[in-house]
């Protein structure tokens, strides 16, 4: 009675294919012959187990790394199969916006590119999707803009997709950086005041960074001194009637505002007494 | 009635610092921005410091940036002038002002006098 | 920046009119200017703000004999009916903002002499 190690090892996939990622996959270890018998079968990279119903190994929720798997079967002896790859498929893995041009703070005006980036993929044809707000803007891998605009800013996101499924990007927030515009004197409480009271004059605008320095200005284009966004006359006289503007200015550059004109009108006692 | 009250000047070493004071009273202070201005022993006026109601702007001439720092505690309704490395030149009588409404200084302190000299 | 320029001083025989001169420099002659009064041994006193139309907003307690007036790059003091406590020098001043760093100037001041 010659005793030998199982002959003709040989590991079996009993799914389908293809295997997705998640699936649960069924392996058989086979053999042709053995003596004495087998008493137990190890799995790599999976471990031992003793009891020979073990032959079969179920593989829960595979993942996209399982990539080989070996079984042995063992009598007095192991002997092992070569290897199977499960070439398990999956959806795009780690996808993320990424800058790639300007290097440094984007600025109105500037061309941006911006490139979606994943790690792996299989199967490795991919189409991908570019969307800001809920609304598809491209394609293509590369999202460009040949002139950025403040309106341009805002979350971006890329999807990436392949035959198994789609996987998107953390939002990125595109950040715009430029000069104050739309600048405007508001006047409260109205543009109308009496001698004697208080009038706020208001510089409104829009800048990414903010306003860091304001400066006022009366219709000869004289600065006042003052370098607030509000500036309060309190009381305010009938001599101080005209128009007035201002200039904000941030890292970027400055902007203006249109004239604003106030206007200071004499109290019934002033009146009274000419 | 307002009221601008410098104090803290006197005799200092070239080289040396000094901080002069002003306190207001008859008015908001908080809401005012302030000036000090000096005045020469040639009687010339001299705009030497500006700071904003809240204190967050300040402005120097060049003949004092670096070397003059202006403040303010609008709690204590006042106004600080810290002085170094003072020369010569820096002699004069120190006038606190407050700022009018659009263009102008409307109302001057007494003064307090700084002599650089060794 | 701006720059003011003044006689250096004037004399007026008493219960005349005076009219003193602050003249701005070419580039700014639209700019609103600062009148101030320096009595022998005092501080200065705001006067009157002066606008280049001629309006103008006078200070606390300053008679009406003064009054202001403008041409051009020109802006004037006048005192009418001139007192002994007129006797001071006047001072003009203006201020501006260039590169983002405001600045305030004054012109040299006249010296205003009462006689009789």
């Known amino acids: 009675d010659v005793q030998y190690p199982p002959k003709k090892v040989t590991t079996v996939i009993q799914n389908p294919m293809p295997i997705r990622e998640g699936d649960t996959v069924t392996l058989s270890c086979n053999y042709n012959s053995s003596n004495p018998s087998v008493t137990r079968y190890e799995w790599k990279p999976h471990g031992a187990w003793e009891e020979p119903s073990l032959g079969v190994l179920k593989i829960q929720n595979v993942g996209w790394d399982n990539t080989t798997i070996a079984c042995a079967a063992c009598n007095s002896w192991c002997s092992w199969a070569s290897p199977v790859a499960l070439n398990v498929q999956y959806a795009p893995r780690d996808v993320r916006v990424r800058k790639i041009k300007p290097l440094s703070e984007i600025h109105s005006g500037n061309s941006v590119s911006l490139q979606c980036d994943f790690s792996s993929s299989h199967p490795k044809e991919v189409q991908f999707f570019w969307e800001k707000n809920g609304r598809l803007l491209g394609k293509e891998s590369q999202l460009n803009f040949d002139s950025i605009s403040p309106e341009d800013a805002g979350s971006y996101s890329c999807w990436v997709n392949n035959s198994i499924g789609q996987t998107a990007s953390k939002a990125w927030t595109l950040e715009v950086l430029y000069a104050p515009r739309r600048l405007r004197v508001s006047m409260s409480p109205g543009d109308q005041v009496m001698e004697g009271k208080s009038a706020t004059l208001t510089c409104e605008s829009d800048a990414n960074p903010p306003v860091s320095h304001y400066t006022w200005f009366d219709w000869n284009n004289q600065s006042l001194p003052y370098h607030s966004q509000k500036l309060r006359l309190e009381p305010v006289k009938v001599q101080h009637s005209g128009a007035y503007w201002c200039q904000g200015t941030n890292s970027v550059g400055k902007g203006r505002s249109p004239l604003s004109t106030l206007t200071v009108y004499y109290s019934p006692e002033t009146i009274g007494r000419r | 009635e307002v009221k601008l009250v410098e104090s803290g000047g006197g005799l200092v070493l070239p080289g040396g610092s000094l901080k002069i004071s002003c306190a207001a009273s008859g008015f908001t202070f908080s809401d005012y921005y302030m000036y000090w201005i000096r005045q020469t022993p040639d009687k010339r006026l001299e705009w030497v410091a500006y700071i904003s109601n809240t204190g967050y702007s300040t402005f120097y001439p060049d003949s004092v940036k670096g070397r003059f720092t202006v403040s303010r505690d609008n709690a204590k309704n006042t106004l600080y002038l810290q002085m170094s490395r003072l020369q010569s030149e820096d002699t004069a009588m120190y006038y606190c002002?407050?700022?009018?409404?659009?263009?102008?200084?409307?109302?001057w302190g007494q003064g307090t006098s700084v002599t650089v000299s060794s | 920046q701006p720059v003011l320029t003044q006689s250096s001083s004037a004399s007026f025989s008493l219960g005349a009119s005076a009219k003193l001169t602050c003249t701005l420099s070419?580039?700014?002659?639209?700019?609103?200017i600062g009148w101030y009064q320096q009595q022998p041994l005092k501080p200065p006193k705001y006067v009157m703000e002066l606008k280049h139309d001629g309006s103008r907003h006078t200070g606390d307690g300053i008679p009406d004999r003064f009054s202001g007036s403008s041409s051009g790059a020109d802006r004037y003091l006048s005192i009418s009916n001139i007192q002994p406590e007129d006797e001071a020098t006047y001072i003009c001043g203006v201020g501006d903002t260039i590169k983002e760093q405001f600045m305030y100037v004054f012109g040299g001041g006249t010296k205003v002499t009462v006689l009789g």
């Open positions: 002002a407050r700022h009018g409404i659009l263009y102008a200084m409307d109302y």
């Open positions: 070419s580039q700014y002659s639209t700019y609103t």
